[in-house]
Interface confidence: low
């Protein structure tokens, strides 16, 4: 199917921050189409032609010293000056998960289930979410869907146990988050109507 | 290669492309968008309330915009007119909290692997289109270089409605629909030995 | 735009005092982090407290001054300053200041002509 | 707390000579740092930001320089006007909520 033709450029000015700002990179990309063609890596210290098709922009870069001491200045001017307010901001933010527990199938005793434990609208992205059975640790037959970004500055994950419940057993999935001053736990009991978060 | 950090920031994600011709500005910080600038009205619109407290100026947006479209004009010479090559956009439906019907949520359409950056993003409900209580992203960069873009839809939940998400693109031969209903929980009896 | 102090006076030891900023050619409305700043006579400027007169009302203060100073905002266009148990130590010409909005580094680009805590038994 | 530590605390200078300040951080504030000149009886006015961003309305004859701990404030081709007393302010986040916004201990140029 014919469609349009379109050409598309890219320049992206990304900064990577390890260790607060004691360890920071500055790599600003032009791309054209999909190619990354020109890269100014602040580790380098200028201009790198990526592909033969960036060679002239570098080139010509590399000769302009306001360009080339801009660049090199950016480490500092746009990085470290913009994590100051990404510390103030973004980097303190805090939303708690949401944990809830349900079985994948109506229940029935020693017949085979799914119990899904669904960790929803929590931010910063790192999250621990544990199963336990009678106060043990499951890690057999435990899948988790990768970390899911919602696109909303909050994330959602979904650990399953496969489990075959025995009258009595009590099952907990346990989530730690920086968000949480003590872990949540959420059980739930076979032949319970409900989840129930402690 | 992907270099490991604490965080990464985009300060900023600039494109530009002859189709239309159009263009965005925006800034991104561990994968999420910070603020777009609306290029037509010349505004900075913030994505996360607690950064509105901060100014950017949408004319450095502008500026940097124009010098895109510089370098984009040589590029297509330089490359003899080699247009962006059509990728096959991947479309995920999801909600955003555990479905209980009657209960107000958000359903969630990824659509992944976007190139070049100029998709349609429709919902239906019962096959008849939607577009109250519908909105969506700026396109997010990837490190691949190819886009991702998510759009929304508030709805209460019925065992009545399904929905799709539907995704119009050069990619694809015909558009793409992403089915969602609402999984009813199994529902709970005593249970037997 | 300009900023104005009022409400310093001559008090004794112990006694509390409160401080108003005014702010005129602009409001609040347009979020700003505003501060006071002070000088003891003959010496160097010293920061004690700033707000963020958005939604989230934020407050900052250094270590020492946390406790027995208190800023507030009081209306679209006023900034208070709540001191107590003053000392002799408090004596100081009071600034208020607007901080320069927008960068990751904050400074202070508006001043008022400050207005005088004498503290004096 | 972060501590501003500025020298000279008193330089003299004359018309048209060059005069520096230094102001030194006890720990890196990267580029947070702002210049101010203060007359008596008048309220500081902001010369330089950002260690080296010259305020609007300011003389280009002040320039700053410096990141980090170490930092500078020169005024080339001093004039009579320029007497006054010169602070440094660093501004340093320091996580939880906590600022650091610390100013030098201010020094005073006098032109012969």
């Known amino acids: 199917r014919d469609s349009p033709e379109d050409f598309v450029y890219q320049f992206k000015g990304m900064c990577y921050f390890t260790n607060g700002t004691e360890r920071v990179r500055l790599v600003s990309r032009s791309i054209y189409n999909r190619e990354e063609i020109v890269r100014f890596d602040s580790d380098v210290g200028e201009f790198r032609a990526v592909t033969l098709l960036g060679l002239p922009a570098a080139e010509y870069w590399n000769s302009q010293k306001d360009i080339l001491e801009r660049k090199r200045a950016a480490v500092d001017r746009v990085c470290r000056h913009n994590y100051q307010l990404e510390l103030r901001t973004t980097l303190q933010r805090r939303v708690e998960p949401t944990v809830t527990i349900s079985p994948s199938r109506t229940e029935a005793l020693n017949h085979h289930n799914l119990l899904v434990c669904s960790v929803t609208d929590f931010y910063p992205a790192q999250i621990k979410v544990r199963w336990f059975r009678n106060d043990q640790e499951e890690t057999a037959g435990v899948v988790s869907t990768p970390l899911i970004r919602n696109g909303d500055w909050t994330f959602q994950i979904l650990v399953m146990l496969e489990m075959t419940p025995q009258r009595g057993d009590v099952y907990t999935c346990h989530v730690e988050h920086p968000s949480l001053q003590s872990p949540i736990t959420v059980e739930w009991r076979a032949q319970s109507e409900s989840a129930q978060s402690k | 290669e992907d270099i490991v950090a604490d965080h990464v920031a985009s300060y900023g994600v600039n494109l530009y492309q002859s189709y239309g011709p159009s263009g965005q500005y925006t800034h991104e910080f561990d994968g999420d968008e910070q603020f777009y600038v609306d290029l037509g009205r010349k505004e900075t619109v913030w994505c996360l309330p607690v950064l509105r407290q901060f100014r950017f100026d949408p004319q450095f947006a502008l500026t940097n915009i124009a010098v895109l479209k510089h370098n984009l004009n040589s590029l297509i010479k330089r490359s003899n007119s080699t247009a962006a090559t059509n990728e096959v956009p991947e479309v995920t439906v999801f909600s955003k909290s555990p479905v209980t019907l009657g209960q107000p949520n958000i359903l969630i359409c990824l659509v992944d692997n976007i190139f070049p950056p100029v998709v349609n993003i429709t919902w239906l409900s019962n096959g008849h289109s939607v577009t109250e209580g519908v909105s969506e992203t700026s396109f997010l960069s990837k490190s691949d270089h190819s886009f991702f873009k998510i759009s929304y839809l508030t709805l209460l939940p019925s065992a009545e409605e399904s929905y799709d998400c539907k995704v119009e693109h050069w990619g694809l031969d015909k558009p793409l629909l992403k089915h969602w209903e609402p999984e009813i929980p199994a529902p709970m009896s005593e249970l037997t030995e | 735009q300009s900023l104005e102090e009022s409400g310093g006076d001559l008090v004794k030891p112990g006694a509390s005092l409160t401080l108003t900023c005014t702010a005129s050619?602009?409001?609040?409305?347009?979020?700003?982090?505003m501060c006071w700043v002070r000088q003891a006579p003959g010496k160097g400027l010293e920061w004690i407290a700033c707000?963020?007169?958005?939604?989230?009302?934020?407050t900052y203060y250094p270590s020492w001054a946390k406790g027995r100073f208190t800023i507030s905002k009081t209306s679209s266009t006023t900034v208070t300053l709540q001191m107590t148990s003053l000392t002799a130590a408090d004596t100081a010409t009071y600034f208020c200041?607007?901080?320069?909005?927008?960068?990751?580094?904050?400074?202070?680009?508006?001043w008022g002509p400050g207005t005088l805590v004498t503290v004096s038994s | 707390d972060i501590v501003m530590t500025q020298t000279p605390s008193s330089v003299s200078a004359a018309v048209g000579g060059t005069v520096t300040i230094k102001c030194q951080a006890s720990?890196?504030?990267?580029?947070?740092l702002a210049w101010y000149q203060q007359k008596p009886g008048q309220p500081p006015k902001l010369l330089i930001y950002?260690?080296?961003d010259l305020a609007s309305g300011v003389p280009s004859r002040f320039s700053g320089s410096g990141s980090g701990t170490e930092f500078t404030l020169a005024i080339s081709g001093v004039q009579c006007d320029d007497a006054a007393t010169y602070y440094c302010?660093?501004?340093?986040?320091?996580?939880?909520?906590?600022?650091?916004?610390?100013f030098g201990g201010g020094t005073k140029v006098e032109i012969k």
């Open positions: 200041a607007r901080v320069r909005a927008g960068s990751g580094y904050y400074y202070f680009n508006l």
């Open positions: 050619g602009f409001s609040f409305s347009s979020s700003y982090y």
């Open positions: 707000i963020y007169t958005g939604s989230s009302g934020s």
């Open positions: 720990q890196t504030i990267y580029s947070g």
């Open positions: 950002d260690a080296s």
């Open positions: 302010h660093g501004d340093y986040y320091g996580g939880s909520g906590t600022f650091f916004w610390t």
